[in-house]
């Protein structure tokens, strides 16, 4: 069967820029190496924000210059994306793919819409 | 812009070995799976193994299981397939194509080909 | 492992004419993971349909992909001389990734 993600449809990023969603996914197979990609999707053009590999039961480990941050629990990831302005709003969807043992499965969530507001700089106090 | 260019097809016996190398240019060669795919003569598309972004996972279609080995030389930007114990049945043009962003079982870059004729 | 069968083998149309080829997978395993690649005689295959219905960069919108599950369709609304050529649909939700054995779209 296809691998079926969910994750929420719309996410409010925080005033400082945070955002954090769940990715959770249904396991067809008994994967020990996971990979989770957060890709962004802006007009037909699809780029990488970030990726991990993790092995099941271990933490969910970016790269230390990645703006993301995670964690997981069984077939559910915990997501956080640092850093965002109001220029990253979009839609950020969540790609998983059991990578071993074989069979390779891959799943592609619908994503999640980010909104992100840039906020209102202090006025200057006397 | 991206470009992909196999070579070291040719004619070879059976039971012999070949090596295949595809050159990678115009694109981040590390961040993307990449694949071999064959067509024999006048037959359709075959996938033949896969290699993923960092080399660790790879997977074979049964039919070169155990015969075929890829790999990848991400500072040389080169993708590799060994073919040992050739078979009549491997005489194909074998492309290199990348995976996609999105999906990497999405063939979204081709190579031009290389022929490869296993025959005594 | 996920087999793809694709009718029909052949399909003669004039240019001009609508073309619909169609794809059907042995079990839902592709859900839209489905790709749809058009290949022209001593040519490397193009990438034209991903995501089912999702078409790629350069594309032409008189291609379009449709489908789910197991039953895919590709439509060429209006064909134009280029595009007498034969076209193969993949899986990619699943190793290994297999293809259909294609359809030649030729001229009447």
């Known amino acids: 069967k296809a691998m079926h993600v969910a994750q929420p449809a719309v996410v409010l990023a925080s005033s400082r820029g945070i955002a954090s969603f769940v990715c959770e996914y249904a396991s067809p197979g008994k994967a020990t190496e996971v990979r989770v990609t957060v890709l962004r999707q802006a007009d037909s053009q699809v780029t990488e924000v970030c990726a991990a590999t993790y092995m099941m039961g271990n933490e969910l480990t970016f790269l230390d210059d990645s703006i993301c941050t995670g964690t997981s629990s069984g077939n559910q990831v915990n997501l956080t994306i640092q850093g965002l302005r109001a220029m990253d709003t979009g839609l950020y969807i969540c790609k998983v793919e059991l990578m071993y043992p074989p069979p390779y499965y891959l799943g592609i969530g619908n994503g999640t819409q980010i909104y992100v507001i840039d906020p209102e700089p202090c006025p200057d106090s006397d | 812009q991206v470009q992909l260019v196999e070579s070291g097809g040719g004619v070879v016996q059976p039971g012999r070995s070949l090596r295949l190398s595809c050159a990678a240019s115009?694109?981040?060669?590390?961040?993307?799976?990449m694949h071999w795919v064959r067509q024999a003569p006048g037959k359709g598309l075959e996938w033949v193994a896969v290699i993923w972004y960092d080399g660790n996972n790879k997977y074979y279609a049964d039919s070169v299981k155990g015969r075929f080995t890829i790999s990848r030389d991400n500072s040389k930007n080169t993708l590799y397939l060994q073919m040992y114990s050739l078979r009549a049945e491997d005489t194909a043009v074998y492309y290199c194509?990348?995976?996609?962003?999105?999906?990497?079982?999405?063939?979204?870059?081709w190579g031009q080909g290389t022929l490869v004729t296993v025959s005594s | 492992e996920i087999v793809l069968t694709q009718s029909p083998g052949t399909l003669s149309l004039s240019p001009g004419d609508r073309a619909t080829l169609s794809c059907r997978a042995s079990?839902?395993?592709?859900?839209?993971?489905l790709a749809w690649y058009q290949q022209k005689p001593g040519q490397a295959p193009r990438l034209l349909i991903y995501?089912?219905?999702s078409r790629a960069t350069g594309i032409p919108d008189r291609f379009s992909g449709s489908g789910s599950g197991t039953d895919f369709t590709l439509t060429i609304s209006r064909l134009e001389p280029e595009d007498f050529a034969v076209y193969y649909c993949?899986?990619?939700?699943?190793?290994?990734?297999?293809s259909g054995p294609g359809t030649k779209v030729d001229i009447k």
């Open positions: 194509a990348r995976g996609g962003i999105l999906a990497a079982g999405i063939f979204d870059y």
């Open positions: 115009g694109f981040t060669f590390s961040s993307y799976g």
């Open positions: 993949q899986q990619y939700g699943t190793s290994p990734f297999t």
């Open positions: 995501g089912a219905s």
């Open positions: 079990q839902s395993g592709s859900s839209s993971y």
